[in-house]
């Protein structure tokens, strides 16, 4: 049974490290729901396509999350 | 720095239970997936058992399930294998192993710290 | 259950020689799954890769992993001594986690 279709939440050890934007491919914040009751995010690393559970209550994750929401609010018009 | 020690061990008779315990250290526990792996004496790795960091999501291999049971304290910082119905083939090394930082069902990590392991022998 | 199957079983070679060490899965397994380990007599093992071709943490260069689907490698580019022991390949795309048999690595 692959384990995908069983479990509803993703993370199954989260980091509370530091990542560096730049080393972002793709970061995706999911909302706690009926599937899972926890918010999970999710960073796509460029290097080799890692993907990467990170820790929503570290300072350094929320420090990343407010760096990339400002980069993205200078990017849209 | 970074240890995992297992403890609880033994001789135990088939049929009879014992709950081992993995004290861990030097690192933030609850943040991190944890594991039993068995190695039988001169045989491979096995393993047993997996539950996630929060403590919600566990796995069993097949030769264990509705016998062995997994489960941690965080605030103790402490992995537990409850095993009951023991038997002669449960007999081996036990290791409780972290799971890598931010694996998930994406992307595996592996088992990055390992523990020294504790010997459970079952004889009648 | 996903099995795997590691071949040669016993590989017998001289130091500063070059090991390949093979890991063939029943079924299809994402690269991001696959992981390898080294295991001394008497040691608890110690993880080499993971992502089927990343070094762990402090893991020297001489050991490198690749492969895709159901063939994976474990090449140790020039033996030490210390290089001596059992390997073990290890999946993690379906549950149940499984291990290979392992690989025993011994000096000729």
């Known amino acids: 049974v692959p384990l995908s279709r069983t479990v509803r939440c993703t993370c199954i050890s989260i980091s509370n490290q530091p990542v560096n934007p730049r080393s972002l491919e793709k970061l995706e914040i999911i909302p706690a729901s009926q599937f899972c009751p926890r918010v999970e995010i999710i960073a796509t690393m460029k290097k080799k396509g890692e993907k990467r559970c990170l820790n929503p209550e570290s300072k350094a994750i929320k420090n990343l999350l407010k760096a990339v929401s400002k980069e993205m609010s200078k990017r849209s018009p | 720095q970074v240890q995992l020690v297992e403890s609880g061990g033994g001789v135990v008779q088939p049929g009879r239970s014992l709950r081992l315990s993995c004290a861990a250290s030097g690192f933030t526990f609850s943040s991190y997936g944890m594991h039993w792996v068995r190695q039988a004496p001169g045989k491979g790795l096995e393993w047993v058992a997996v539950?996630?960091?929060?403590?919600?999501?566990?796995y069993y291999a097949d030769s264990v399930k509705g016998r062995f049971t997994i489960s941690r304290d965080n605030s103790k910082n402490t992995l537990y294998l409850q095993m009951n119905s023991l038997r002669a083939e449960d007999t081996a090394v036990y290791y409780c192993a972290r799971e890598g930082a931010g694996s998930s069902l994406y992307y595996y990590y592996g088992m990055d710290v390992w523990g020294q392991g504790t010997t459970v022998t079952v004889s009648s | 259950e996903i099995v795997l199957t590691q071949s040669p079983g016993t590989l017998s070679l001289s130091p500063g020689e070059r090991a390949t060490l093979s890991c063939r899965a029943s079924q299809s397994v994402s690269s991001g799954h696959l992981a390898w380990y080294q295991q001394k007599p008497g040691q608890a093992p110690r993880l080499l890769i993971y992502g089927a071709s990343s070094r762990a943490t402090g893991i020297p260069g001489r050991f490198s992993g690749s492969g895709s689907g159901t063939d994976f490698t474990l090449t140790i580019s020039r033996l030490e001594p210390e290089d001596f022991a059992v390997y073990y390949c290890?999946?993690?795309?379906?549950?149940?986690?499984?291990f290979g048999q392992g690989t025993k690595l011994e000096i000729k």
């Open positions: 539950i996630w960091f929060e403590g919600s999501i566990k």
């Open positions: 290890q999946q993690y795309g379906s549950s149940p986690y499984t």
